[in-house]
């Protein structure tokens, strides 16, 4: 004959466990139903009587199958720096990540506690790894024969076009020009494997940044002042 | 011109800790980014870590982070990639790169063998 | 992690052909990518950077193409010193990974 399904609550088997989506309830010392996610325990069970489960109110959620007297808050609003990539529903929390600019300066279990905007590599300087999700930019300075003449976060240093005849100069932080009619981006032969830097470290100090194109994280994170090196990289 | 010159190469006995060092000559070590790659023999490359001199962070590949330290000394231009609780996989060259601003490891050293063999 | 799946894995070509590489990310990387050539016993050396930038000192026949998933590295005219094997590798995102390698041989 097959086992009879036995319906919650109902006592275990001495040595055995509660099922799937069941608990076993201290005091009644019986098998008893979990609520849904969504739900949470209004009435604990009894002898007689199974769990007596409600959905959560606004603003609360259960994420799994519980049995939890008060459904959990949801985390507050994104910040400004933040976008909602996962809203507030009675099955799920609220996950704020950073907007595009900026990485996560101090993560926290899904989503990000501290949004910081990423650096921006001045003139003269390129971004040696970029900004990730969880990652600050590093700026290090143009080699000759590159050059960078933007304030950014995602502009690498580039090769100086070739001239015919080179009316001015290139330099770190600005392109040659030309006096011919074709100029070329194609390299220059040679067999350098790596381009000496023009700056120093001296000269790797960022002046004081207009707040529209460099902000500064100074005041966000454990740092001192902002040169264009900083930043860690990582997810 | 800049150069990247690693030490020599080494052996270990598995459980040991290796230390390679890798000399910045010609220019500055604060203006790059210094990674580490292993190459196994007759495999490809993986990227161990990186770090960045003038600030002194690091950033680890998650096979490797519980075992790796990647360190600089900029007053002798060198970086130092440490290696702990060496096994037999751990057999391969050692590499060090630099990274500059056009965003690519544009200078290797010449590699360090490491060999971990009981 | 993002994997970076190169083909064929050994190409045969013969002096003075064309050579085309390929190399796919499992993901976006955007133009992220960078080709090496290693030569046996030797260190690997950047050819081309951000896809399709050619570093410098590097001869004009090596050019790169593609953006977000599919990449190409190709030699227009194989000189005997190109036969190598060579390496595909992403930095848009930790860990940074490389390809498995396209080994360049003389047909």
């Known amino acids: 004959l097959p086992a009879q399904v036995a319906f919650t609550p109902y006592a275990p088997e001495p040595g055995s466990t509660c099922r799937l989506r069941e608990y076993y309830d201290q005091t009644a010392q019986m098998c008893c139903s979990k609520c849904s996610p969504g739900q949470h325990a209004k009435v604990f069970c009894t002898k007689t009587s199974d769990t007596v489960c409600d959905s959560c109110e606004d603003s609360t959620y259960t994420q799994l199958w519980n049995w939890v007297p008060e459904c959990l808050s949801c985390g507050s609003r994104c910040s400004s720096d933040q976008v909602e990539t996962q809203a507030c529903t009675r099955e799920q929390n609220r996950i704020c990540t950073c907007r595009p600019g900026w990485y996560c300066a101090l993560s926290k279990q899904e989503g990000c506690r501290l949004c910081a905007p990423l650096r921006k590599c001045r003139p003269g300087f390129g971004v040696a790894r970029p900004g990730t999700e969880t990652s600050d930019v590093v700026c290090k300075p143009c080699a000759p024969g590159t050059f960078s003449n933007t304030t950014s976060s995602t502009d690498i240093c580039r090769p100086h076009q070739i001239c015919n005849v080179v009316a001015i100069p290139g330099n770190a932080s600005m392109d040659a020009v030309c006096t011919s009619t074709s100029p070329t981006r194609s390299m220059a032969p040679g067999a350098v494997h790596l381009p000496q830097p023009v700056s120093t470290r001296s000269q790797h100090t960022q002046p004081t940044p207009e707040p529209s194109t460099a902000p500064s994280t100074s005041f966000l994170l454990p740092m001192g002042p902002s040169p264009p090196a900083e930043g860690s990289t990582g997810d | 011109e800049v150069q990247l010159v690693q030490s020599g190469a080494e052996v270990k006995k598995p459980g040991a800790t290796v230390k390679i060092s890798c000399k910045v000559s010609?220019?500055?070590?604060?203006?790059?980014?210094l990674h580490w790659v292993q190459q196994a023999p007759g495999k490809g490359l993986e990227w161990m870590g990186w770090i960045d001199p003038e600030e002194g962070k690091t950033k680890y590949g998650q096979k490797f982070q519980s075992r790796v330290t990647i360190t600089a000394d900029t007053s002798t231009d060198t970086a130092y990639m440490e290696l702990s609780s060496l096994r037999s996989e751990d057999t391969a060259v050692y590499y060090c790169a630099a990274n500059s601003a056009t965003g690519t490891m544009d200078a290797w050293g010449q590699g360090t063998l490491v060999t971990v063999s009981s | 992690d993002i994997v970076m799946t190169q083909s064929p894995a050994t190409l045969s070509v013969s002096p003075g052909e064309r050579a085309t590489l390929s190399c796919k990310a499992s993901q976006n990387v955007g133009s992220n990518v960078d080709w090496y050539q290693q030569k046996p016993g030797q260190s690997p050396r950047v050819l081309i950077y951000?896809?399709?930038i050619r570093y410098t000192g590097i001869p004009a026949r090596f050019s790169g193409s593609g953006s977000g998933t599919e990449f190409t590295l190709t030699i227009s005219i194989l000189q005997s010193e190109d036969f190598a094997v060579y390496f595909c590798m992403q930095s848009k995102s930790y860990p940074i990974t490389f390809g498995q390698g396209t080994k360049l041989e003389i047909k």
């Open positions: 010609g220019y500055s070590i604060t203006d790059y980014l």
């Open positions: 951000k896809a399709s």
